[in-house]
């Protein structure tokens, strides 16, 4: 899955002299970009990919550049004009944004500066300055005990969960020994109480993406369409879309004065938390959880529609829309059921029409097993 950058700083630099790029690893949690006539200097808390200093292209003029930090790829790099300079290939620490520091540096200002990041996805324009410094902190060691959850704490929890989903056999990686249902509940609870600015926030990890929307009072006026980004070419499911009918939001509207509700979309690229007795195979290991905060959504008059674009399947495989049912006693694993979901199949597209919200998937059933799924 191609991840967005965790941090992107873009600007324009007027190159009046022959000049260089300097990268300086710094021991504290800050990323800074400093401009002078002789050099553009980047400080960050990641080891350098040698060499630490390189010459910029010769022609003078206005250069557009962007500093990208992608934690999943472990890369910090600078695109200057058309040239790409790798600064660090060990930039995989999880950092939590604290604040942007006031710039006191003297020197030629950087122009048309903007910054975007996972903690503030909207593009923010910054006033011209010769230097910019962004302070970070480490994620908290222990979860906060107050009602709301810090974004970075949630990011760290998702990272741990993603590591477990990647290597489920390494039990030591499991975020907690709790059963899958409790882990899902805990995750939902954190997503519904995470503090964030704006109407929507997204968290991307290798095996789990989570998006949270704040449902506005006007949400019931129209259907909500959600489209995934295109997956890597080799994945079984190339992309998916979700259509949530407006009736869904009309029933979730809180009374005036009541706190707004949230809609969660949890996109798993692993079925490690969804293991049934039959070791059923889920298409592309894709499980989509759709949850409205503190609301059990069932018996919808208009269905939720999930559409999956996928690879062509072998003749003996039937694709079946299913949802996850926890064992109420938690004494045995849950199972997949198709009750309340209708499957519409095309060669490379499967649509699920379901009358409730939960964790959905497309099951790969060998043709003889199809009836067994219906029996649930």
């Amino acid at each position: 899955r191609g991840h967005r950058e965790d941090f992107r700083f873009c600007s324009q630099r007027n190159q009046t002299h022959r000049s260089s790029l300097h990268y300086k690893p710094t021991p504290d949690l800050r990323i800074s970009i400093e401009n002078s006539e002789e050099a553009l200097t980047v400080h960050a808390p990641f080891p350098a990919a040698h060499p630490a200093s390189r010459s910029f292209p010769d022609p003078r003029g206005l250069y557009h550049f962007c500093l990208y930090w992608n934690r999943h790829a472990g890369r910090l790099h600078l695109l200057y004009g058309k040239r790409d300079f790798l600064l660090s290939d060990k930039a995989s620490s999880l950092l939590c944004f604290q604040h942007q520091e006031e710039s006191l540096a003297q020197g030629p200002p950087l122009l048309a500066t903007s910054v975007t990041s996972w903690w503030s996805p909207q593009n923010i324009s910054l006033p011209s300055a010769a230097s910019f410094t962004f302070s970070f902190h480490s994620p908290p060691h222990t979860a906060a005990h107050n009602a709301s959850v810090d974004m970075c704490e949630l990011k760290r929890d998702l990272q741990l969960l993603s590591q477990f989903l990647k290597h489920p056999q390494k039990a030591s990686r499991r975020p907690s020994a709790a059963p899958a249902s409790q882990q899902l509940q805990s995750l939902e609870s954190k997503l519904t109480s995470v503090r964030f600015m704006g109407d929507m926030v997204s968290f991307e990890e290798d095996r789990i993406n989570a998006t949270v929307w704040k449902l506005q009072p006007t949400a019931g006026l129209q259907d909500l369409h959600i489209h995934s980004r295109q997956e890597e070419e080799q994945s079984e499911i190339m992309e998916y879309s979700v259509l949530l009918p407006r009736t869904l939001f009309q029933r979730t509207k809180g009374r005036s004065g009541e706190a707004e509700k949230r809609l969660l979309l949890v996109d798993f690229s692993s079925q490690a938390l969804f293991q049934d007795k039959n070791s059923s195979q889920v298409l592309g290991e894709k499980v989509l959880g759709i949850v409205v905060q503190n609301t059990k959504v069932a018996n919808l008059t208009e269905p939720v529609v999930l559409t999956f674009q996928h690879q062509l399947q072998p003749k003996n495989v039937t694709l079946q829309c299913v949802f996850w049912v926890e064992d109420p006693t938690l004494s045995s694993p849950g199972h997949w059921s198709s009750a309340g979901c209708e499957t519409v199949r095309r060669e490379t597209q499967t649509s699920c029409f379901c009358n409730h919200l939960t964790y959905f998937a497309v099951l790969m059933v060998s043709s003889v097993e199809v009836d067994a799924v219906h029996k649930h």
Epitope: H22, K24, P25, T26, P27, D28, L29, E34, S36, E38, A39, T41, P45, P47, S93, L104, A105, Q106, F136, H137, S138
Partner: antibody, heavy 116, light 107 residues
Framework: QVQLVESGGGVVQPGRSLRLSCTAS????????MHWVRQAPGKGLEWVAV????????YYADSVKGRFTISRDNSKNTLYLQMNSLRAEDTAVYYC?????????WGQGTMVTVSS | EIVLAQSPATLSLSPGERATLSCRAS??????LAWYQQKPGQAPRLLIY???NRATGIPARFSGSGSGTAFTLTISSLEPEDFAVYYC?????????FGQGTRLEIK
């Protein structure tokens, strides 16, 4: 208030070992790089070692490389300097200092004397 | 490594006078230079960082200037408590290095 307190200094014979500690309070220790700096009696300041905020990266002065090890325990808000194969020229006051653009906070220092 | 040469080694002045301390680097260190004050039996105290930024709580009579290889610490009007040893330090390259110090003494 923001404070660094060193301990563990003393008199030690050449070739022996000593471990210095520096306990931090009043700030989020795990967010800062930390350094050890020393000062021989009547002499100037000499930088010894640095450790990244998370312990992932360390640098040493040539004079101590291979003999001294800097480490930290963020859960205890403590910085360490393990000094092995001590020499007479390691005699100095050892300071720990916090990294923020420069050394913005210093401890009061602990004296290490290497003598037979 | 970067060598920092401070001059003069000793500066004898009276309270109220202006003090100018110099620090020269063996190669360009941009603006990554700090100044510290140290009194006998005490730890150093940060005065100026990144060539010209005054550290928190440092009086306005202390100012820094310079970039590249030549830097200056100026004390506009000496107070009795300013008589001490002053060190410059660079953080542009590992290893971090200090100047040998300038002793500011009462004339």
């Amino acid at each position: 208030q923001v404070q660094l307190v060193e301990s563990g200094g003393g008199v030690v014979q050449p070739g022996r070992s000593l471990r210095l500690s520096c306990t931090a309070s009043g700030f989020t220790f795990s967010t800062y790089g930390m350094h050890w700096v020393r000062q021989a009696p009547g002499k100037g300041l000499e930088w010894v070692a640095v450790i990244w905020y998370d312990g992932s990266n360390k640098y040493y002065a040539d004079s101590v490389k291979g003999r001294f090890t800097i480490s930290r325990d963020n859960s205890k808000n403590t910085l360490y300097l393990q000094m092995n194969s001590l020499r007479a020229e390691d005699t100095a006051v050892y300071y720990c200092a916090r990294h923020l653009d420069s050394f913005d906070i210093w401890g009061q220092g602990t004296m290490v004397t290497v003598s037979s | 490594e970067i060598v920092l040469a401070q001059s003069p080694a000793t500066l004898s002045l009276s309270p109220g006078e202006r003090a100018t301390l110099s620090c020269r680097a063996s190669q360009s260190i941009s603006s990554y230079l700090a100044w510290y004050q140290q009194k006998p039996g005490q730890a150093p105290r940060l005065l100026i960082y990144d060539a010209f930024n005054r550290a928190t709580g440092i009086p306005a009579r202390f100012s820094g200037s310079g970039s590249g290889t030549a830097f200056t610490l100026t004390i506009s009007s000496l107070e009795p408590e300013d008589f001490a040893v002053y060190y410059c330090q660079q953080r542009d390259y590992w290893p971090i290095t200090f100047g040998q110090g300038t002793r500011l003494e009462i004339k």
